[in-house]
């Protein structure tokens, strides 16, 4: 008799999930000498242990603690780049400026980036059919709890000047309900972080508005200031030119032609 299976509103676990996580772990530890000591089989076992046989709407940060411990990594605390709804450009930037790090440049972020996973209560099976949607089903699902956990830890580790890339094409440039707005902002440590510098990325070539004056940016400034952290904001009008400039700071295109 076929067992009844819970149908969730979100897509199921990414195909070949265990193989993907293990392969990513091996690749990451080969590229990053400081993480060569990591045993990838143990990492996978800890990852699996966080959600297998558990109800996918009843996952806690505690479930991920063994994985967090194994994936402990020190990144330069003054070289952290947060982002909200502009992941690709943030990653392009850290690929060029190799001394800065997004969450996905760390082992745990790299393992889970763009993947979905969940299990089922009381069975050791991975659910490849469907997983809970954050809005339609439940917020305490394996993927959401994972990102909340690693994002909190990443923000807590930050110091000095923290940068955040924001999407100036969105109706809410700063969104209180994003991971940045709901988790990272509130976990920056005022005793360590001097300034949060927002980089607002413009979408249109002819867009010369000062989006640092946007009401949602003013809201972000207010939240940050109340936490005794200074706030700074920059408009990046031409992200393509900006990246080119980061690659070649000597290039005349970084300034006006004389």
């Amino acid at each position: 008799v076929p067992r009844w299976r819970q149908q969730w509103s979100g897509p199921g676990t990414t195909k070949r999930f265990p193989e993907t996580v293990l392969a990513r772990c091996v690749k990451y530890t080969e590229i990053h000498p400081e993480m060569r000591h990591v045993d990838c089989q143990s990492v996978w076992d800890a990852f699996k242990g966080a959600f297998i046989s558990k109800h996918p709407c009843n996952i806690t940060e505690e479930d991920y603690q063994p994985l967090m411990k194994l994936g402990t990594q020190t990144v330069p605390c003054n070289k952290i780049l947060l982002w909200s709804r502009i992941k690709d450009l943030a990653h392009q930037f850290t690929q060029v400026q190799r001394d800065m790090f997004t969450l996905e440049d760390t082992l745990l972020g790299y393992l889970a980036d763009d993947l979905t996973w969940c299990g089922e209560f009381n069975t050791s099976k991975i659910n490849y059919q469907s997983c809970p949607d954050w809005r339609k089903d439940c917020s305490n699902n394996p993927v959401s709890v994972f990102w909340k956990t690693v994002s909190r830890r990443f923000a807590e580790a930050a110091c000095d000047v923290v940068h955040v890339m924001l999407n100036g094409s969105r109706s809410k440039i700063f969104d209180k309900n994003s991971t940045f707005g709901s988790v990272e902002v509130h976990n920056l440590q005022p005793e360590k972080v001097q300034t949060l510098e927002a980089w607002v990325i413009h979408g249109g070539r002819e867009d010369s508005r000062d989006l640092c004056q946007d009401p949602t940016i003013k809201e972000l400034e207010s939240i940050i200031s109340k936490r005794n952290i200074q706030f700074s904001c920059k408009n990046i009008y031409r992200p393509d030119k900006f990246l080119q400039c980061v690659k070649n700071p000597e290039d005349s295109s970084c300034t006006s032609e004389i």
Partner: nanobody
Framework: QVKLQESGGGLVQPGGSLRLSCVAS????????MGWYRQAPGKQREFVAR???????GYADSVKGRFTISRDNTKNTVYLEMNSLKPEDTAVYYC???????????WGQGTQVTVSS
């Protein structure tokens, strides 16, 4: 508009050091690069060094290893630490700020650096 105010120039002996400062004020949200150019008498203005938000830096070959550019976010200031100065470094040093691919580009009034014994 953005106003750039340089300071720190002066007369120094060969082998000596100077530190130039440039403070930006006004619509600073439009500035993502800050740097230094110089113009010696009878010559064209030339690039010296630049810093981009996030900390990426670039230098002219003639100053690499001797000059260091840095920025202080909180003070909207860029610095140029100049060591092992040579007579050929004598010039008016101009602060420059801008935003690549836009018309947002600004110049300071310049500060004189003279290297002579």
């Amino acid at each position: 508009q953005v106003k750039l105010q340089e300071s720190g120039g002066g007369l120094v002996q060969p082998g000596g050091s100077l530190r130039l400062s440039c403070v930006a004020s006004g619509s600073i949200s439009s500035i993502i690069t800050m740097g230094w150019y110089r113009q010696a008498p009878g010559k064209q203005r030339e690039f010296v060094a630049r810093v981009i938000i996030g900390g990426s830096t670039g230098y002219a070959d003639s100053v690499k290893g001797r000059f260091t550019i840095s920025r202080d976010n909180t003070k909207n200031t860029v610095y140029l630490e100049m060591n092992s100065l040579k007579p050929e470094d004598t010039a008016v040093y101009y602060c420059n700020a801008g935003n690549p691919g836009t018309s947002y580009h600004y110049w300071g009034q310049g500060t004189q650096v003279t290297v002579s014994s």
